[in-house]
């Protein structure tokens, strides 16, 4: 099931998925002056079997100049209204991101790709937050958010992160020592 919304916006922080659950869609967006090739895929889809996950479809962009049109680049699938954007920041690529079964790695960039990636996440997806450069992370708990199905609706859990304006940056998990979680109890699902 697709998540209805974007993860929470934490001031002076960005979020990123380390790996993408099967069912995640990534829009084939092209940068200004380019468009999807005719009959090209609208999106890439993370699919897989019991042993391997990968992205179906390929995104391809071509120069808008090759066609006389003022059409907007890369229309989204009609049924997808929400825009999950993560900026393309190659230094944030984690080393160990896709050993998780049922998950896809970050797709490699395609030629003339837009500067922002628009993902459509599925229930169970986890994203991690880090403070932007020049801000320091104050953790009260996990700096992550998970899309959950609760009481018939999808909802993101609250990341426990505050970014303060000090010249120190935090890292994504995998690039720092793991933090102890404030609650030591197992997760419990509510029943609605």
């Amino acid at each position: 099931e697709l998540c209805d919304d974007d993860p929470p916006e934490i001031p002076h922080a960005t979020f990123k998925a380390m790996a993408y659950k099967e069912g995640t869609m990534l829009n084939c967006e092209c940068k200004r002056g380019f468009r999807r090739i005719k009959s090209g895929s609208l999106y890439m889809l993370c699919t897989g079997n019991s042993s391997h996950s990968s992205w179906d479809n390929q995104c391809q962009c071509t120069s808008s100049a090759t066609r006389n049109t003022t059409k907007q680049v890369t229309p989204q699938p009609e049924e997808q209204k929400e825009r999950k954007t993560t900026e393309m920041q190659s230094p944030m690529q984690p080393v160990d991101q896709a050993s998780l079964p049922g998950h896809c790695r970050e797709p490699p960039p395609w030629e003339n790709e837009a500067t922002e990636r628009i993902y459509h996440f599925v229930v169970g997806q986890m994203v991690y937050y880090q403070c932007v450069q020049g801000y320091r992370a104050l953790h009260r708990g996990p700096a992550e958010s998970v899309c959950k199905m609760t009481h018939g609706k999808t909802r993101w859990t609250q990341p426990q992160l505050i970014c303060t304006g000090e010249m120190e940056t935090s890292q994504f998990p995998g690039e720092e020592k793991p933090q102890a979680s404030p609650e030591g109890r197992p997760e419990s699902e509510t029943s609605c």
Partner: antibody
Framework: QVQLQESGPGLVKPSETLSLTCTVS????????WSWIRQPPGKGLEWIGY???????NYNPSLKSRVTISVDTSKNQFSLKLSSVTAADTAVYYC???????????????WGRGTLVTVSS | EIVMTQSPATLSVSPGERATLSCRAS??????LAWYQQKPGQAPRLLIY???TRATGIPARFSGSGSGTEFTLTISSLQSEDFAVYYC????????FGQGTRLEIK
Amino acid sequence: QVQLQESGPGLVKPSETLSLTCTVSGGSIRSYYWSWIRQPPGKGLEWIGYIYYSGSTNYNPSLKSRVTISVDTSKNQFSLKLSSVTAADTAVYYCARDILTGYSDWFFDLWGRGTLVTVSS
Amino acid sequence: EIVMTQSPATLSVSPGERATLSCRASQSVSSNLAWYQQKPGQAPRLLIYGASTRATGIPARFSGSGSGTEFTLTISSLQSEDFAVYYCQQYNNWITFGQGTRLEIK
């Protein structure tokens, strides 16, 4: 420091629509989910529903048919409308910051001071 | 709807003594329970969630216990500022609150 402030008419006539607004100051409305909760005089608390900055909502099933919660991110505000009110809707109405943790804990960690709404002709 | 019943309705305790407040659920809510404190004319304040986890800034004299249908909030040594109304809230199946226990000075 984030603060919440409820505002709206203190008196509403029966069968009319109760309308309240909660202003979020000192923080972004886009960082959290936000709820309305009410407390009739001398009674316990009742959760009404929540909203996210995207406009996604979830309502108490017992009030769902009469409740609409909306959000205005440009003003950092969210609002409650409760239609076809009766005397039983007389209560102190609170807005609150709504938290769901990774452990599926769901609670309200920050509240406004509340505003009394009386339903009377 | 899960009904939360708090007892006693009013509890009279002397400052410095221990106070024990009870909350019972009409069906199991696992550990999905929170406690709030409310003083006259003020908004409720979150004390405990997950039945036993203290919220940020809550003094150690407040502790929560229990699971399933029986829960307890204990205030180990009552301070003058602790006299208030206390509510429990379950979130296992939607959200419902108890009717409250008034903690008054004996």
